[in-house]
């Protein structure tokens, strides 16, 4: 298999679409409730499913990015020159196996996702064939944040990014030359993927997120909407 520089399969078939090959918009996913034999998903299972849906979407966006530019071949050194302050998990955040702390970790996950929102806004209009997918990733991340906020006990510890700072950052990013914009897009997708994977590993450590329903297959990820919360 030919892989891009970050270890993704470029020719990997991404199952991020619903059965009828259309993305499921918010509030239109009735399949989970329609099937009588299915157990209703717990909130933790829904969070798990939501993250997997977003990760499938990111893979699709990365596929387009890698196909149209050589950014995926760029070395870490070149990427490091792009001084984006993207959220990243660290040992102190309590999300790793050693030093795991459920409350601290949950705060970090929510804070990180809130910080990623401006970058997900930047990604809109950055894709041609996957424009709808980019919107779906953005919208489902908003829903994921709401899910997690309902789960968190210590909401006071969560810092919300300043809208003015975000607006100015967005303007700055959009004013970059084409090469830097391509690099920024690649870096955001790669970092967001890593952050979500770190989050999912941590969430699966948390007590009530041990098993998923038998019918919950990764190849049938669907967008979970606010009405499902």
């Amino acid at each position: 298999d030919y892989k891009d520089h970050d270890g993704d399969y470029k020719d990997h078939d991404i199952d991020y679409k619903d059965d009828d090959d259309k993305l499921v918009p918010p509030g239109e996913d009735s399949k989970d409730v329609a099937a009588p034999h299915r157990q209703p998903l717990t909130s933790s299972e829904r969070i798990d499913k939501q993250i997997r849906y977003i990760l499938d979407g990111i893979s699709a966006l990365r596929k387009e990015t890698c196909n149209k530019s050589n950014m995926c071949e760029s070395s870490k050194e070149a990427l490091a020159e792009n001084n984006l302050n993207l959220p990243k998990m660290a040992e102190k955040d309590g999300c790793f196996q050693s030093g795991f702390n459920e409350e601290t970790c949950l705060v970090k996950i929510i804070t990180g996702l809130l910080e990623f929102e401006v970058y997900l806004e930047y990604l809109q209009n950055r894709f041609e064939s996957s424009e709808e997918q980019a919107r779906a990733v953005q919208m489902s991340t908003k829903v994921l944040i709401q899910f997690l906020q309902k789960k968190a006990k210590n909401l006071d510890a969560i810092t919300t990014p300043d809208p003015t700072t975000n607006a100015s950052l967005l303007t700055k990013l959009q004013a970059q030359n084409q090469w830097l914009q391509d690099m920024t897009t690649h870096l955001i997708l790669r970092s967001f993927k890593e952050f979500l994977q770190s989050s999912l590993r941590a969430l699966r450590q948390m007590g009530d997120l041990i098993s998923v329903p038998v019918d919950s297959r990764g190849s049938e990820q669907k967008l979970i909407s606010e009405e499902d919360l």
Epitope: H5, D8, K76, Q197, R201, R204
Partner: antibody, heavy 121, light 110 residues
Framework: EVQLVESGGGLVQPGGSLRLSCTVS????????MSWVRQAPGKGLEWVGY???????WYANWAKGRFTISRDNSKNTLYLQMNSLRAEDTAVYYC???????????????WGQGTLVTVSS | DIQLTQSPSFLSASVGDRVTITCQAS??????LSWYQQKPGKAPKLLIY???TLTSGVPSRFSGSGSGTEFTLTISSLQPEDFATYYC????????????FGGGTKVEIK
């Protein structure tokens, strides 16, 4: 050509320590999730642990506290530090490159040839 | 603690036979399962991931199916080079587990 080459195996006494190395060529190690897997003579595969690109490490229950996985991206090398070794740790130790879609679904698509560790007095 | 049970442990078959190996998880693992082939003295080789996706370069006689707790690896027509040991690997949770691999199934010549 992408290659993983393990080294550092050999004979060690019970209670002793050993550090295995896995030198990676042809790829940027920092971009990949990595794993150590071992296989005792005539037995099945036994997972030791993972190190992910976020720098987190995850270990099998039996390996926690005794084994440590680390990486030096500048040297493109993965390590396995093994302490308080026992006879039952005798095995061929493999390093493997992983690709992960979600959380722990790390498919190990490239393996080294393995290095034999013998724990005996 | 997720455990994988492979059956059978040993399987005798002839060239041309259809061979089925099962892997059962102690709890649901979605479709987060991979299959490996290992020949004596060699490192394992990835065959299938995400329960049913064939790795590039692996012959189409190999197929994987299943979701949740029950998974199957099928070799539609056994070839001489397929005599080996096969392992499943779960990828749902690696926290609080003793092993992510199943015990293995050795496919021998009848």
């Amino acid at each position: 050509e992408v290659q993983l080459v393990e080294s550092g195996g050999g004979l060690v006494q019970p209670g002793g320590s050993l550090r295995l190395s896995c030198t990676v060529s042809g790829i940027d190690l920092s971009s990949y999730d990595m794993s150590w897997v071992r296989q005792a003579p005539g037995k099945g595969l036994e997972w030791v642990g993972y190190i992910y690109t976020d720098s987190s490490t995850w270990y099998a229950n039996w390996a926690k506290g005794r084994f440590t996985i680390s990486r030096d991206n500048s040297k493109n090398t993965l390590y396995l530090q093994m302490n308080s070794l026992r006879a039952e740790d005798t095995a061929v130790y493999y390093c493997a490159r992983g690709s992960t879609d979600y959380a722990f679904d790390t498919r190990l698509d490239l393996w080294g040839q393995g290095t034999l560790v013998t724990v005996s007095s | 603690d997720i455990q994988l049970t492979q059956s059978p442990s040993f399987l005798s078959a002839s060239v041309g036979d259809r061979v089925t190996i099962t892997c059962q998880a102690s709890q649901s693992i979605s479709n987060e399962l991979s299959w490996y082939q290992q020949k004596p003295g060699k490192a394992p080789k990835l065959l299938i991931y995400r329960a049913s996706t064939l790795t590039s370069g692996v012959p189409s006689r190999f197929s994987g199916s299943g979701s949740g707790t029950e998974f199957t690896l099928t070799i539609s027509s056994l070839q001489p080079e397929d005599f080996a040991t096969y392992y499943c690997q779960q990828g749902y949770n690696s926290n609080d587990v003793d092993n992510v691999f199943g015990g293995g199934t050795k496919v021998e010549i009848k």
